[in-house]
């Protein structure tokens, strides 16, 4: 688990207690099992504009 | 370039313990895994564990839990693995690899291979 | 655990021919990202194993183009399209989609 007292990880990372630090989600296309994409599972994208009415 | 320079060869007698090493060089340790692998004369490869050197964390196969311990020293960008009560079943080449954990896939690197012996 | 399974030995093959490696694994490679988590290694004689292979079908680095694969979430195949004396050795399929990391038992390429 995070550290108490440390910054939340900013939006599309997630954070590593493997690693120790917060991660890009991107890198979970290397190596999915790694713990912090757990996270990046559970926290959608961004949300994106409908290229359509 | 990224280099994994493994220990030389060992000679143990069975019951004992041995202590084989990785260093590597070439780019930051502590942001990629190090693992080890077995691989019998003729035979295959058999994942043993790996480390993550920042934080020593360790992932083992449930095979050799208890037969392996993975540490490794930031300090010298080393890893070791050691082997405990050793039979002639552990007579094998170990090799050390980089795994990486990024986006950006540039492959895995493997040491040289360490060869282990064991006979009385 | 995931059972990756290959046959021991390929077909002998001529130089400069083409030649064909398979490999099964015991459940689907493919994530919910669209990716297949297979990798191919060579061990050349008294070397280390070298990736070939990443995510099914991308080349490594420094790896000729001689080399391809492809295949569904469980089935796999390693083409070699000019088979070179440079290319023999045992050919190790392996997944990366969870651990343990397991490999298959390798498949020896020979030449007629």
């Known amino acids: 688990e995070q550290a108490p007292g440390t910054a939340p990880c900013s939006r599309g990372s997630s954070w590593s207690a493997d690693l120790d630090k917060c991660m890009d989600c991107a890198s979970c296309r290397a190596r999915p099992h790694s713990d912090f994409c757990l996270g990046c599972a559970a926290a959608p994208p961004a949300p994106f504009r409908l290229l359509w009415p | 370039q990224v280099q994994l320079q493994q220990s030389g060869p060992e000679l143990v007698k069975p019951g004992a313990s041995v202590k084989m090493s990785c260093k590597a060089s070439g780019y930051t340790f502590t942001d990629f895994i190090i693992a080890w692998v077995k691989q019998r004369t003729g035979q295959g490869l058999e994942w043993i564990g790996e480390i993550y050197p920042g934080t020593g964390r360790t992932y083992y196969s449930e095979k050799f839990r208890g037969k392996a311990t993975l540490t490794a020293d930031k300090s010298s960008n080393t890893a070791y693995m050691q082997l405990s009560s050793l039979t002639s079943v552990d007579s094998a080449v170990y090799f050390c690899a980089r795994r990486t954990i990024y986006y950006d896939y540039d492959g895995d690197y493997w040491g040289q291979g360490t060869t282990l012996t064991v006979s009385s | 655990d995931i059972v990756m399974t290959q046959a021991a030995f390929s077909n002998p093959v001529t130089l400069g021919t083409s030649a064909s490696i398979s490999c099964r694994s015991s459940?689907?490679?493919?994530?919910?990202?669209?990716?297949?988590?297979l990798y191919w290694y060579l061990q050349k004689p008294g070397q280390s194993p070298q990736l070939l292979i990443y995510q099914m079908s991308n080349l490594a680095s420094g790896v000729p183009d001689r080399f391809s694969s492809s295949g569904s979430g469980t089935d796999f195949t390693l083409r070699i399209s000019r088979v070179e004396a440079e290319d023999v050795g045992v050919y190790y399929c392996?997944?990366?989609?969870?651990?343990?990391?397991?490999f298959g038992g390798g498949t020896k390429l020979e030449l007629k």
């Open positions: 459940k689907s490679l493919l994530h919910s990202s669209g990716i297949t988590y």
């Open positions: 392996a997944h990366n989609l969870e651990l343990p990391w397991t």
